[in-house]
């Protein structure tokens, strides 16, 4: 499945296998979390809509030295059609709201699970 139930995005939409792998990685992060994820680092909240893969990457790329999310950062970069670097922001960021990385990951996970279901049951 290369189209996920009405989900519009500039650039590539991950096929179900790639999306599934990303979700599995986020599940692993949330389940294996013992100490505060990334030492409680804060990131910009994002709108979980079109283009959110790039927005998520733009937010998470500003967290450095956190091995727990490195694989997620790499996976998201594969879903984003343009190169993302630290300090870059898109209109999808809720610029007045910062949340902990752990909450960001949970929110992203819930949304991606929903997208995965929509892609399966279309």
């Amino acid at each position: 499945l290369t189209c996920l139930g009405g989900f519009a995005s500039p650039g590539p939409v991950p096929p179900s296998t790639a999306l599934r792998e990303l979700i599995e990685e986020l599940v692993n992060i949330t389940q294996n979390q013992k100490a505060p994820l990334c030492n409680g680092s804060m990131v910009w909240s994002i709108n979980l809509t079109a283009g959110m893969y790039c927005a998520a990457l733009e937010s998470l790329i500003n967290v450095s030295g956190c091995s727990a999310i490195e694989k997620t950062q790499r996976m998201l970069s594969g879903f984003c059609p343009h190169k993302v670097s630290a300090g870059q922001f898109s209109s999808l960021h809720v610029r007045d709201t910062k949340i902990e990385v752990a909450q960001f990951v949970k929110d992203l996970l819930l949304h991606l699970k929903k997208l995965f279901r929509e892609g399966q049951f279309n």
Partner: antibody, heavy 120, light 107 residues
Framework: QVQLQQSGAELVRPGASVTLSCKAS????????MHWVKQTPVHGLEWIGG????????ASNQKFKGKAILTADKSSSTAYMELRSLTSEDSAVYYC?????FGGGPFAYWGQGTLVTVSA | DIKMTQSPSSMYASLGERVTITCKAS??????LSWFQQKPGKSPKTLIY???RLVDGVPSRFSGSGSGQDYSLTISSLDYEDMGIYYC?????????FGGGTKLEIK
Amino acid sequence: QVQLQQSGAELVRPGASVTLSCKASGYTFTDYEMHWVKQTPVHGLEWIGGIDPETGGTASNQKFKGKAILTADKSSSTAYMELRSLTSEDSAVYYCTSGDYFGGGPFAYWGQGTLVTVSA
Amino acid sequence: DIKMTQSPSSMYASLGERVTITCKASQDINSYLSWFQQKPGKSPKTLIYRANRLVDGVPSRFSGSGSGQDYSLTISSLDYEDMGIYYCLQYDEFPYTFGGGTKLEIK
């Protein structure tokens, strides 16, 4: 805890239709996909199809296309399966089953089953 | 459709014995496999998902392993309450398909 409560046994005439229900409780109904499974002594367990209760989107086993119609009512947290043009081949126990694909699997929780007997 | 071949179809084992049931998929299913136990007149009960993850509340004597096309369910020390029929299920792609079942009886 998660519970799936299915409707009672049905005795139906050949050619008729029947609608089975599955009421979910103990979780947010729209968070998990819902599937239906047929069990007979001859064919064992067979996946009929599934539904995303949030969108109403469905996926079906080609073998049951036109036979089973799946719907879900968010307001009552209930999934339905209508079986049409029944024949003796449709006599079976039907289960609803749900779960988180990524945590427990899509068939983590099962209803108690509904026995459907097709007989003149 | 992905065919799931389960073996043996039936077996007898003694209490305390180590029991292994296998399931072979007709193609790679990426470890998207569940194991279920069913007792007469009851609904199936999920034991394992994602090939090797134990469901909460399931005794630790049950374990799952495998990858690619080959998977197995092992009961490390058979208990009287373990008798029943065991099924595998692939949920890698639609249509989801079950194995034919393994009837486990106590010797």
